[in-house]
Amino acid sequence: WQVPRPPTWGQVQPKDVPRSWEHGSSPAWEPLEAEARQQRDSCQLVLVESIPQDLPSAAGSPSAQPLGQAWLQLLDTAQESVHVASYYWSLTGPDIGVNDSSSQLGEALLQKLQQLLGRNISLAVATSSPTLARTSTDLQVLAARGAHVRQVPMGRLTRGVLHSKFWVVDGRHIYMGSANMDWRSLTQVKELGAVIYNCSHLAQDLEKTFQTYWVLGVPKAVLPKTWPQNFSSHFNRFQPFHGLFDGVPTTAYFSASPPALCPQGRTRDLEALLAVMGSAQEFIYASVMEYFPTTRFSHPPRYWPVLDNALRAAAFGKGVRVRLLVGCGLNTDPTMFPYLRSLQALSNPAANVSVDVKVFIVPVGNHSNIPFSRVNHSKFMVTEKAAYIGTSNWSEDYFSSTAGVGLVVTQSPGAQPAGATVQEQLRQLFERDWSSRYAVGLDGQAPGQDCVWQG
């Protein structure tokens, strides 16, 4: 069978793809349709976030749309198809043996997805093998109601996982960001993402990445030496999408990892990150759950200083102000801290070298019954020029073997009221977190504290 898709998309004929891929299909580019669609496009980008329960912000501080609200809205918008890529699914409390009222939003989302299927809207899910949620029944429940589900064997194919988290709705709307399909992502974990509405060009481009997962989810799938042309991207760092987002001139493109899942024209995720860092002249602010200039999932670990070097070079060579805000929770690997201290040690204000590192600690409070939660899970970066919103933690595996995506957006300042560009909105969210009492300098994060809130 083929993933149902909006009717305006062409179907690839079996002769266009290797025989082993005939179970799947990929979008064909139809210039006339695309042109018609572009005229109807009125792209809009909304930043979305989850703030864990009982994590109050200072009054009047900036905020983004709540993620749970945005997801439910997207599903209300759906008319034909919803395609979801997610590392794992765990939308109900019983999935993880937890009885907690904060799981209700996830359970409502699962209900909404079932209702969607009842309305004859197609749901296609690409998820990872290996996965974290081996006891979850979400996907069985959805499959029983007609959802199409494929496990992508990234462990076998690339020795990684499918770590992407994105939706494509009706080939027109997009969610992408740090949040997995997990109830904790809505109420117990700090997340950051973006929803793009009415933007079929970008949606269809991201759909091509979904299709790379889809064809790899058939039995005995192998990685192609070269991806067929219909998987190629027209938008990349050299040729981004140009459009008006709410009337604001905007360039945007999606990047992907690992390289083996980057068909022609697709910018590699690492290259996108480095390009955004490299173009910064004033500041680089990054908020990531993990920062390791090493591999994470291979024995023994290898040193991998690519991102570390880029931050150091920006700070030391160009006087760019670097701020790194790293997640810190009960399940944070403490071997990360020496690398953070090493980066911070480069800072030398007298020589105009500014590198600051903090950890963001979400107080556990009375939520200790919820495992793998209460952490800043965001993966974004902002400079004065661009916003980068990703799905990857910052260590080698996420760029070399693990499937992820990134979104790079640049908006023209001056064409709209001050503070309205995406990069300015993201900077404000970063600075809110950076200046909050939950952001702790490394000096205040003594070894052995295990990321426990000392507030």
Epitope: Y87, S129, P130, T131, L132, R134, T135, Q151, G155, R156, V161, H163, M289, E290, R296, F297, G327, G329, L330, N331, T332, D333, P334, S368, N369, P371, F372, V375, H377, N393, D450
Partner: antibody, heavy 124, light 107 residues
Amino acid sequence: DVQLQESGPGLVKPSQSLSLTCSVTGYSISSHYYWSWIRQFPGNRLEWMGYISYDGSNNYNPSLKNRISITRDTSKNQFFLKLNSVTTEDTATYNCAREGPLYYGNPYWYFDVWGAGTTVTVSS
Amino acid sequence: DIQMTQTTSSLSASLGGSVTISCRASQDIDNYLNWYQQKPDGTVKLLIYYTSRLHSGVPSRFSGSGSGTDYSLTISNLEQEDIATYFCQQFNTLPRTFGGGTKLEIK
């Protein structure tokens, strides 16, 4: 270097309780792992009995559910096994082991450190 | 519970040769399989996790493969120190379960 060492009586009478201690050095039992008990019966068969998590929560093998309790003392970095109403069928070598690592996002779990084991005979 | 079966309880091979030990699960465990070595003195050591990934410090003579319900551990260029019993273990679901073990002897 992380080390686990089991201790406790080598002989227990039927119907009594078996109590063992696992002393952990080189790593905090409040961090990042499940701390398990695994036993090996004469003839080599291994049985996972249960764990206490870094956060103090438990999970037990359903075959032992009504008889087993795993607790801990974080100040001494020790965790304990108590098995009630033992019979001769519980004669085995008892090992403690850690399973993980339970870092965010890591899907690969394994028993990477084992104790040497302590032999317990149930006999009157 | 998932049953893990190692049909061969013991086998012998020559030094320098190679040997394959197999393990079968009662249902698909989706590659969530680990291999352990237990020396004659009772010491247990992790060799391979997630079907085929070598743990730190384990010689590359050890390799693992498999999928679905069928898995295997191969030891090539056998050395005297490989005399041990080898166990498979699934971590797909709780309770964790182990195979019955395969004892390796040198001819």
